[in-house]
């Protein structure tokens, strides 16, 4: 009785179960009654990452420097190349096919989370008592200067974009 289903890592062909090729190898010829499945290793810059019956290996992804990409992890015969973005850029999608510059947090906003190769800068508004007077992809909101600890008084209150201005205690208004 010919089989209708095969074991794991096998496939059904011509009413018989043949072994799949292991990751990193492609199928050259199916097994027969008398011979095993014939597989060949993938060539340079090719890969197959599963047990398979593919007759052609996949090309490694190309990390195009013109798109701001660089190799994060070199591909093997069993794994694809992983691309990431150059410094100051991050991927536009999960598959990282191209890169865009990190955004800066505008004055009045600070960096909540610094960008990585795969995620953009996350900004947050500076709350009362904190300020940011720069556009930056790295700077957090900074606390207002404490005039009191310097034996000074506030001459001008701070805002989310400016620090307080301190002055001498005896200032006449």
């Amino acid at each position: 009785e010919p089989p209708t289903a095969c074991r794991e890592k096998q496939y059904l062909i011509n009413s018989q179960c043949c072994s799949l090729c292991q990751p990193g190898q492609k199928l050259v010829s199916d097994c027969t009654e008398f011979t095993e499945t014939e597989c060949l290793p993938c060539g340079e810059s090719e890969f197959l990452d599963t047990w398979n019956r593919e007759t052609r290996c996949h090309q490694h992804k190309y990390c195009d420097p013109n798109l701001g990409l660089r190799v994060q992890q070199k591909g093997t015969s069993e794994t694809d190349t992983i691309c990431t973005c150059e410094e100051g850029l991050h991927c536009t999608s999960e598959s990282c096919e191209s890169c865009v510059p990190h955004r800066s947090c505008l004055p009045g906003f600070g960096v909540k989370q610094i960008a990585t190769g795969v995620s953009d800068t996350i900004c947050e508004p500076c709350p009362v008592g904190f300020f940011s007077n720069v556009s930056s992809a790295f700077e957090k909101c900074r606390p207002w200067t404490s005039c009191e600890t310097k034996d000074l008084v506030v001459q001008q209150a701070g805002t989310n974009k400016t620090d307080v201005v301190c002055g001498p205690q005896d200032r006449q208004r």
């Epitope: 947050e124 709350p127 009362v128 008084v153 506030v154």
Partner: antibody, heavy 122, light 113 residues
Framework: QVQLVQSGAEVKKPGSSVKVSCKAS????????IEWIRQAPGQCLEWMGS????????NYAQKFQGRVTITADTSTSTAYMELSSLRSEDTAVYYC???????????????WGQGTLVTVSS | DIQMTQSPSSVSASVGDRVTITCRAS????????????LAWYQQKPGKAPKLLIY???SLQSGVPSRFSGSGSGTDFTLTISSLQPEDFATYYC?????????FGCGTKVEIK
């Protein structure tokens, strides 16, 4: 202890102005923000603006910008809130409250005045 | 401006009941640098000024009974009265102090059932 004592009730005509005072005691007046909040009958609390008496720095809610003036006299530890071009919708209880004390961590209002009822009626 | 939305607008309860009031902000009130939520809760009785109960979302103001507690983070906050007392029948307001202009919720009135 901290105390904020406000001026008495006022009845005003539409188009006129009102000036409410808030006398502070029991803390350093010049280094603590004074906040002004109003509450129309049956309405939500509405922040109007604030002043840091020692510097004269002010913040105003956009809704009241140009119509409200907040001032302070450090010699008498008194803050003032003047509202001009009064209309009937300005009928409300006006409160002063103490805000941050210069520590930059006490922005909530821990002490309030008793409130001043301003009635605008022709 | 940050909008503050309170619910419910009123609640009927009996002495001894557990009462929960919620407040939602239109943007996060949590600041990553100090991990503080810029939110306060006040109690107001008819004809009186509001009274501070809770600040930094969960810190109990000195002199306020421990049956009052605040919780939540980011945009969603809760004021809980664990066992309602006769003197707790009042209107409760949340307020943010993250950035100008400060804004309040429109209040939750706790009434006698």
């Amino acid at each position: 202890q901290v105390q904020l004592v406000q001026s008495g009730a006022e009845v005003k005509k539409p188009g006129s102005s009102v000036k409410v005072s808030c006398k502070a005691s029991g803390y350093t007046f010049s280094t603590s923000w004074i906040e002004w909040i109003r509450q129309a009958p049956g309405q939500c609390l509405e922040w109007m603006g604030s002043i840091l008496p020692g510097s004269g720095s002010t913040n105003y809610a956009q809704k009241f910008q140009g119509r409200v003036t907040i001032t302070a006299d450090t010699s008498t530890s008194t803050a003032y809130m003047e509202l001009s071009s009064l209309r009937s919708e300005d009928t409300a209880v006006y409160y002063c409250a103490r805000g941050d004390d210069g520590s930059y961590v006490r922005w909530y209002f821990d002490h309030w005045g008793q409130g001043t009822l301003v009635t605008v009626s022709s | 401006d940050i909008q503050m939305t309170q619910s419910p607008s009123s609640v009927s309860a009996s002495v001894g009941d557990r009462v929960t009031i919620t407040c939602r902000a239109s943007q996060s009130l949590l600041f990553s640098v100090n991990q503080k939520n810029y939110l306060a809760w006040y109690q107001q009785k008819p004809g009186k000024a509001p009274k501070l109960l809770i600040y930094w979302a969960s810190s109990l103001q000195s002199g306020v009974p421990s049956r009052f507690s605040g919780s939540g983070s980011g945009t969603d906050f809760t004021l809980t009265i664990s066992s309602l007392q006769p003197e707790d029948f009042a209107t409760y307001y949340c307020q943010h102090y993250y950035s100008y202009p400060w804004t309040f919720g429109c209040g939750t009135k706790v009434e006698i059932k």
